[in-house]
Each structure stands twice: as structure tokens, then as C-alpha cells.
């Protein structure tokens, strides 16, 4: 059960809902965005104020952390299982410190299982946050401070902070160090979406959300 199913059941107010893992009774709490683009979006990541530390372990990124009412990571295992069942789209919403907003929409998104290090798969980019994907293609394995699966002889997660699908180390990291306004430029380990704001610019807010492609 995801936010799209909840929306279709008649619950159309954005907020925290209890979702269930596919083919399981295991539950997880998530923020459902029922307003953006027709609603039904399961929010899998959100940054807004730096209140949550995103330099976490593999286990924490696997299971999720933070609060769905604020900053959080839903959890790689749930997202992997969910996106393995049906075709999902991924929408990434970004805000800078100058009041601008942009988005990237991928028309097919899924995460491989833990045995494949939750490798990300993405196709079909559209949107206003750059014509080139800021998540390297083909998709990379997920890396954290205690699980280095990137393509760099360095350790991307330790240098750039946070868990992410680092390449070597690549043009994005929405789980980087949060920097407040006036401290957000020329930061090499911040919240980055290169093909929108270039290098060294740390964003104000980010949201990653998924929804079935046939919603």
C-alpha cells in the first residue's frame, strides 16, 4: 500500500499515513503529498532546515530515519520493494535560496535490492532542473559512510557527506550537509543538483517523491 492507493481510497489530504510493505504486514510511516500534480505521491526524501543529520549508516538508510513531518529518508528497503512491484515515476522538487523552484521528473524509477546495493535505475528525464540528469547514468550503487560502493578511489560519502548514489563522485547529492542562507555557496559537501545550480551551491529544500506510472 502506497500513497497512490491511499489517495484512490478517498483520503486526499496531505499528511502522514501508514504504508505497508508489498506482500507483507510490515508497516512504515510516510508523508503523502496529495496536492502536487494530482496527488498520490509517496515522499521518500525531504530536506528543509538541517534539523536531521543525514550522515548516517547503511542500516539507517536501509530502514529510514527522521520524521515524515519534517526532514526524513523513507528507507531504501521499502522503496526497493515498492518500485520492484510496479513501474514508478520519480519527481524531485528543488528550492534555492533566491526563491526559485525547479523539478526533475523521471518516467521510470526503481531501486535494485540490497544485494545490488540499492542501485538506482532511471530513464526519461524531463523538467526544469537541467536537461542532463544530475543523477549519473547508468545508475550507481548506493554508498554510505560505512559502505563504500562508489566508482571513486576516494570515499565519496565521507568526503561529500550523506548516503547517495555516488558515481565518482558525480553531479548530485541531495543528502549532503545542510548549509543555511549566506553560508550555502562554495560548499563542496552541500546539497547539490549540479545541472540546475552548478557546483558548490547548497540548496534550501529538496523533496523526492514517487508515484505509480499509471496513476
Amino acid at each position: 500500500r502506497d500513497c497512490a492507493e491511499i489517495f484512490k481510497s478517498g483520503l486526499t489530504t496531505s499528511g502522514i499515513y501508514t504504508l505497508t510493505f508489498p506482500n507483507s504486514t510490515e508497516e512504515i510511516k510516510a508523508y503523502c503529498d496529495m496536492d502536487v500534480g494530482g496527488g498520490g505521491w509517496t515522499v521518500i526524501q525531504h530536506r528543509e532546515d538541517g534539523s536531521v543529520d543525514f550522515q548516517r549508516t547503511w542500516k539507517e538508510y536501509k530502514e529510514g530515519f527522521g520524521s515524515p513531518l519534517g526532514e526524513y529518508w523513507l528507507g531504501n528497503e521499502f522503496v526497493s520493494q515498492l518500485t520492484g512491484q510496479h513501474r514508478y515515476v520519480l519527481k524531485i522538487q528543488l528550492k534555492d535560496w533566491e526563491g526559485n523552484e525547479a523539478h526533475s521528473l523521471y518516467d521510470h524509477f526503481y531501486l535494485a535490492g540490497e544485494e545490488s546495493n540499492y542501485r538506482i535505475h532511471l530513464t526519461g528525464l524531463t523538467g526544469t532542473a537541467g536537461k542532463i540528469s544530475s543523477i549519473s547514468q547508468p545508475g550507481s550503487d548506493f554508498s554510505t559512510k560505512d559502505s563504500d560502493n562508489d566508482k571513486c578511489i576516494c570515499k565519496c560519502s565521507q568526503m561529500l557527506s550523506g548516503g547517495w548514489w555516488f558515481d565518482a563522485c558525480g553531479p548530485s547529492n541531495l543528502n549532503g550537509q545542510y548549509y543555511p542562507q549566506k553560508q550555502n555557496t562554495n560548499k563542496f559537501n552541500g546539497i547539490k543538483w549540479y545541472y540546475w545550480k552548478g557546483s558548490g551551491y547548497s540548496l534550501k529544500a529538496t523533496t523526492m517523491m514517487i508515484r505509480p506510472a499509471d496513476f
Epitope: 571513486c152 576516494c154 570515499k155 565521507q158 563522485c169 553531479p171 563542496f188 549540479y194 552548478g198 557546483s199
Partner: antibody
């Protein structure tokens, strides 16, 4: 392979300007940035500033602020550095060097061959 | 600005010797440090980045270590072609800054 080829030797009078070019080949220009570094005779390395090959964002060393301008021409994959109001102590070899801007890695590889700028009356 | 202090300023060593060059940063860099080699009349060449990652094609006798504010470049079994000046560079924040250099001479 990746190459950075700089323009030739320049001799300038005090108060003049110089514009050095750095033509690149062998990689995706927009994924990288360029630092400009100079080396006065017998001295160490001094960073002048940086420009993004993606969007032209710049960051200049405080010492050169207002006197240096860095630009790029994506159509020719070329970076430029102009230094104005030249003084005799600006005599140096000026290098351009590439970084992995899109990864936020600002170590420099490769470097151009260098351009000797001599300022003398 | 982050100040980078290199020592020694010069060293004279024999072929086969181990040479250690240190670099101290005025504030913590995590692992955002690179080492370069420069021979007379040529441009610097990147040897090591991320404090300890050897650049492709660089001989394994070169190694880097350290994090935070203290870093070192070690040349194991110095070779005749290793003469030149070595520089450290911080890549933690703009402005990028270099150490003053260490001149390595072969005895």
C-alpha cells in the same frame, strides 16, 4: 586524451591588459571547471580564481578581485583569463588547469603548458 | 583563507631513501587535499588527491596520508626522476591555496 593548450608568450607594458586562452579537447567541457594559477620566477604557485565550464560561475581570489575576469566559450571549448592594470610583479607563468567541477573536486589535472607573461616598460 | 604550511622547504636525499614531506592546514580539511610534483620548466602534475588516493599512472612508491589538519607525502625508495618541487593544495573551500613547496634534490 585530455589536453589543455594555452596561448603564447605575452610581453606587456605596465597598466596594460593581457588575455590568455586555454583551449581544451578530449572530454566534456561542461562537466568541468578551470582554475588559473600563476608562478612568478623562482616562486611557488598562486591561485587567481576559478570558472565553471557548465554555467560560467566564477570565484576569484580576493587579491585579484576587480582586476581579473575569467570567461568560457563553450562553442570552442576554450577558457579565458584577462588580467588588467598590469604591474611588473605580475610577471609570471600563468597556467590553466582543469578540475572535476561536477563532482566538486577542485584538484587540478591536467594543466596547460603555461603562458609566460612579462610586464616591463 | 586556509593557510597551508609545508615542511621542510628543501630536502637532499640519496636514491633509495625514503622522503617524507608534511603539510599543515590552518583549519580542518577532512580529506580535501592534493599533492603535485613540478619539474623545472614544466607544469605541475597531480600525484595524489583525496589525501591518499594515487592518481592514475603515478608510481606506487608515492603515497599520501593524513586527514584534518596534518598530511604527509611519502616517497619510498627515491628515484632519480623524483627530483623537483612538491606542493600540497587544499580543495576544501575557495580560495584554493597551495603550500610553499618542498624542493627535493638527489644527492
Amino acid at each position: 586524451q585530455v589536453q589543455l593548450v594555452q596561448s603564447g608568450v605575452e610581453v606587456k607594458k605596465p597598466g596594460a591588459s593581457v588575455k590568455v586562452s586555454c583551449k581544451t579537447s578530449g572530454y566534456t567541457f561542461s562537466n568541468n571547471g578551470f582554475s588559473w594559477v600563476r608562478q612568478a620566477p623562482g616562486q611557488g604557485l598562486e591561485w587567481l580564481g576559478w570558472i565553471s565550464g557548465y554555467n560560467g560561475n566564477t570565484n576569484y581570489a580576493q587579491k585579484f578581485q576587480g582586476r581579473v575576469t575569467m570567461t568560457t566559450d563553450t562553442s570552442t571549448s576554450t577558457a579565458y583569463m584577462e588580467l588588467r592594470t598590469l604591474r611588473s610583479d605580475d610577471t609570471a607563468v600563468y597556467y590553466c588547469a582543469r578540475d572535476q567541477d561536477y563532482s566538486n573536486f577542485h584538484w587540478l589535472d591536467p594543466w596547460g603548458q603555461g603562458t609566460l607573461v612579462t610586464v616591463a616598460s | 583563507d586556509i593557510q597551508m604550511t609545508q615542511s621542510p622547504s628543501s630536502v637532499s636525499a640519496s636514491v633509495g631513501d625514503r622522503v617524507i614531506i608534511t603539510c599543515r592546514a590552518s583549519q580542518g580539511l577532512s580529506s580535501w587535499l592534493a599533492w603535485y610534483q613540478q619539474k623545472p620548466g614544466t607544469a605541475p602534475k597531480l600525484l595524489i588527491h583525496s589525501a591518499s588516493s594515487l592518481q592514475t599512472g603515478v608510481p606506487s612508491r608515492f603515497s599520501g596520508s593524513g586527514s584534518g589538519t596534518e598530511f604527509a607525502l611519502t616517497i619510498n625508495s627515491l628515484q632519480p626522476e623524483d627530483f623537483g618541487t612538491y606542493y600540497c593544495q587544499q580543495a576544501n573551500s575557495f580560495p584554493l591555496t597551495f603550500g610553499g613547496g618542498t624542493r627535493v634534490e638527489i644527492k
